[in-house]
């Protein structure tokens, strides 16, 4: 989704939860 | 300086829909992740779903019925909806940034009662 | 029934070292995935102490570790301290969703 947009789609993207840990932890510089 | 934090309704009817909105500052809901939590007085915490940094959205099974969450980027919030409440639902819903194994700020919690 | 199975309660002196368990399956814990462990005293926000089964979050006293032994996610806290009396859960999913252990109370004895 484009800054400025509300995103309702479910599934646009083919990630994993398993993937979306791991970036999150990452972009948390945890 | 990271924050998140929840509202509305603290009352809601059986049978109604629940919705609560996050407001987050501090970092962006497009890059990071949110995730929505509730505990119900003296229980442990139940993991509602989240919204991922892909855009994906993700949901406990046993409310994926039931559970929507949606994000809009130009207001730092994300949603929760929950249809079909019942007393069940009364619970402290929280959401907070990350998904799960590493969710390292919080919302301060708004109860939510379920009650005619 | 909780998908992560921990004590219900468990107890040490002052100074001792205690240790709480998570025990899961080869679909979360055993996988690989990551463990998160928190803790939560009564009227606040669960607070992370340890992210990536292993490390601790920033902030955290090095007397709390986390580590893995197969389907097992262990907290483990030395030199308890009267201000660890809370509750702990441990948190990891699998496939498409997460979830939270089934909490395990510290006591602290003086």
């Known amino acids: 989704s484009s800054t400025g947009s509300i995103d309702m789609v479910d599934s646009p993207q083919l990630a994993t939860l398993a993937d979306e840990v791991s970036a999150s932890l990452a972009k948390q510089g945890l | 300086q990271v924050q998140l934090q929840e509202s509305g309704p603290s009352l809601v009817k059986p049978s109604q829909t629940l919705s609560l909105t996050c407001t987050v500052s501090?970092?962006?809901?497009?890059?990071?992740?949110v995730a929505w939590v509730r505990q119900a007085p003296g229980k442990v915490p139940e993991w509602l779903g989240a919204s991922g940094s892909s855009g994906n959205k993700y949901y406990n099974p046993a409310l994926k019925s039931r559970l929507s969450i949606t994000r809009d980027t130009s207001k730092s919030q994300v949603s929760l909806s929950l249809s079909s409440v019942t007393t069940e639902d009364t619970a402290v819903y929280y959401c907070a940034r990350g998904i799960i194994a590493g969710v390292d700020v919080w919302g301060r919690g708004l109860l939510v009662t379920v009650s005619s | 029934q909780a998908v992560l199975t921990q004590p219900s309660s468990v107890s040490g002196s002052l100074g001792q070292r205690v240790s709480i368990t998570c025990s899961g399956s080869?679909?979360?814990?055993?996988?690989?995935?990551?463990v998160g462990w928190y803790q939560q005293v009564p009227g606040s926000a669960p607070k992370l102490l340890i992210y990536?089964?292993?490390i601790r979050a920033s902030g955290v006293p090095d007397r709390f570790s986390g580590s893995r032994s197969g389907d097992t996610a262990t907290l483990t806290i030395t030199s308890l301290q009267a201000e660890d009396e809370a509750d702990y859960y441990c948190a990891s999913y699998q496939s498409n969703y997460a979830f939270f252990g089934s909490g395990t109370r510290l006591t602290v004895l003086g």
């Open positions: 501090g970092f962006s809901v497009i890059s990071d992740s």
């Open positions: 080869s679909s979360n814990v055993g996988y690989g995935n990551y």
């Open positions: 990536g089964t292993a």
